[in-house]
């Protein structure tokens, strides 16, 4: 249970985290299991321990083996094992299965490929990405932080994706590569950036002073079940529940699913007994999901009374 497989390529950096974790204040000792020899902590060594991390800078095939980490606290010790294998670099483009990280799936609307293990390293953007050894080029590919986004994913986008980045340790740079497979699934459901159907952006809504008024915020978020989807109103940038005007309340409308399968939500803003000061407020309809937030602003204007005189 507390053993972890780690692998890397010779002459690249490899950083391994102890499978047993504890508070940052706990000391962690590392040993090479075969010889029970302690791993030094001095950074001048090619292989050294740094708290929960074991660093190979760079790695050599001879480093392969099982490493023991012992997390020591005042009241207990916990032992973990890191099974490290360092492979020779392949001369051809083929990445063998034993160098592959977990496969990720994407769909037409959701196509992020995270660079495996990158959070262990001290790296700076941008990442380089390759598919089947070819550098990715074109506007469909966007390297963003620690992941790759592919726009308008097609079945041909399936394949092996390699991220390449530079780890910096005390001014010295070391290359790191990691590869994982990407499969494309034809999803029935999907999520997209919120689309506000109503109100229109910067809409002016005519109201009568002293009467009641309703504003509807309606947005769609994709197709099928949504992890997170919400619509809400804000007044002058403040949530309705915090604004403190009991005449102005919001209530959830009906969840809608149109014939085309889109998942949509309504939120109705009810203003009782409209007052002059309500015309000075900015009304924001917000739609939020895991892709982000979209805001449409509405202002109220006084409806001119109809002149009944000829």
């Amino acid at each position: 249970k507390f053993s972890k497989q780690s692998w890397g390529l010779e002459n690249e950096a490899l950083i391994v985290r102890c499978p047993r974790q504890g508070k940052p204040s706990y000391t962690v000792d590392w040993y090479y299991s075969q010889t029970n020899k302690s791993i030094p902590t001095q950074e001048r060594n090619r292989v050294f321990a740094s708290g929960q991390l074991l660093k190979f800078l760079p790695a050599a095939v001879a480093d392969s083996g099982i490493y023991t980490c012992i997390v020591r606290s005042p009241t207990f010790n916990r032992t973990g094992y890191a099974n490290v294998t360092i492979y020779k670099k392949q001369s051809d483009c083929n990445v063998p299965d034993y160098l592959m990280y977990s496969t990720v799936s994407g769909s037409e609307k959701n196509s992020k490929i995270y660079c495996p293990t990158i959070d262990l390293y001290n790296w700076t953007a941008p990442l380089e990405w390759f598919k089947n050894c070819q550098a990715l080029q074109g506007s469909r590919y966007r390297a963003h932080k620690s992941f790759l986004v592919i726009d308008n994913v097609m079945t041909e986008d399936a394949g092996d994706y390699t991220c390449k980045f530079i780890h910096n340790e005390n001014g010295a740079n070391y290359s790191v590569t990691a590869t994982r497979s990407f499969t494309v699934k034809d999803e029935q459901g999907f999520s997209l950036f919120p689309v506000i159907g109503a109100p229109a952006q910067n809409e002016i809504k005519e109201v009568e002073i002293g009467k009641n008024a309703n504003l509807t915020c309606s947005a769609c978020f994709g197709k099928g079940t949504q992890f997170l989807a919400a619509v809400l109103w804000q007044l002058n940038g403040t949530k309705i529940t915090d604004f403190g005007e009991p005449r102005i309340q919001q209530e959830e409308g009906q969840n809608q699913s149109f014939s085309n399968g889109l998942a949509c939500l309504d939120m109705v803003l009810r203003i009782a007994d409209v007052k002059e000061e309500d015309l000075l407020l900015q009304y924001d309809c917000l739609a939020l999901n895991l892709h982000g937030l979209r805001r449409h602003t509405v202002r109220l204007s006084r409806k001119n009374p109809i002149d009944h005189h000829s």
């Epitope: 952006q201 919400a230 809400l232």
Partner: nanobody
């Protein structure tokens, strides 16, 4: 821009509880939508919970009934109360805030540095 600082992470036994805090500064807290996300080793960052206003909260299916998100506007702080913790809850937990602009993509949310939660016996 909102600066976010998480705290409260640590090592806890299965079945135990933790309360994470996220202190916000640098912008109007009360108009921001606050959320918690988590990233387990080798996995993608995933949604945990969001508080839209004092009456509206949303949760990932995997934490419903166990986790509770709340916010205290007077302290500019959001909280995540985590009960009945499981080993699979082990992850770095990130606080996030969104507000302000007309359109804000998920990558443009303001993010904290994260706090590690380890659930292990």
């Amino acid at each position: 821009e909102v600066q976010l600082v998480e705290s409260g992470g640590g090592l806890v036994q299965p079945g135990g509880s933790l309360r994470l805090s996220c202190a916000a500064s640098g912008s109007t807290f009360s108009n921001a939508v606050m959320g918690w996300f988590r990233q387990a080793p080798g996995k993608e960052r995933e949604f945990v919970a969001v508080i839209i206003d004092s009456r509206t909260t949303k949760y990932a299916d995997s934490v419903k009934g166990r986790f509770t998100i709340s916010a205290d506007n007077s302290k500019n702080t959001a909280y995540l109360q985590m009960n009945s913790l499981k080993p699979e809850d082990t992850a770095v937990y990130y606080c996030a805030a969104v507000g302000g602009a007309t359109t804000v993509t998920a990558s443009e949310w303001d993010w904290g540095q994260g706090t590690l939660v380890t659930v292990s016996s």
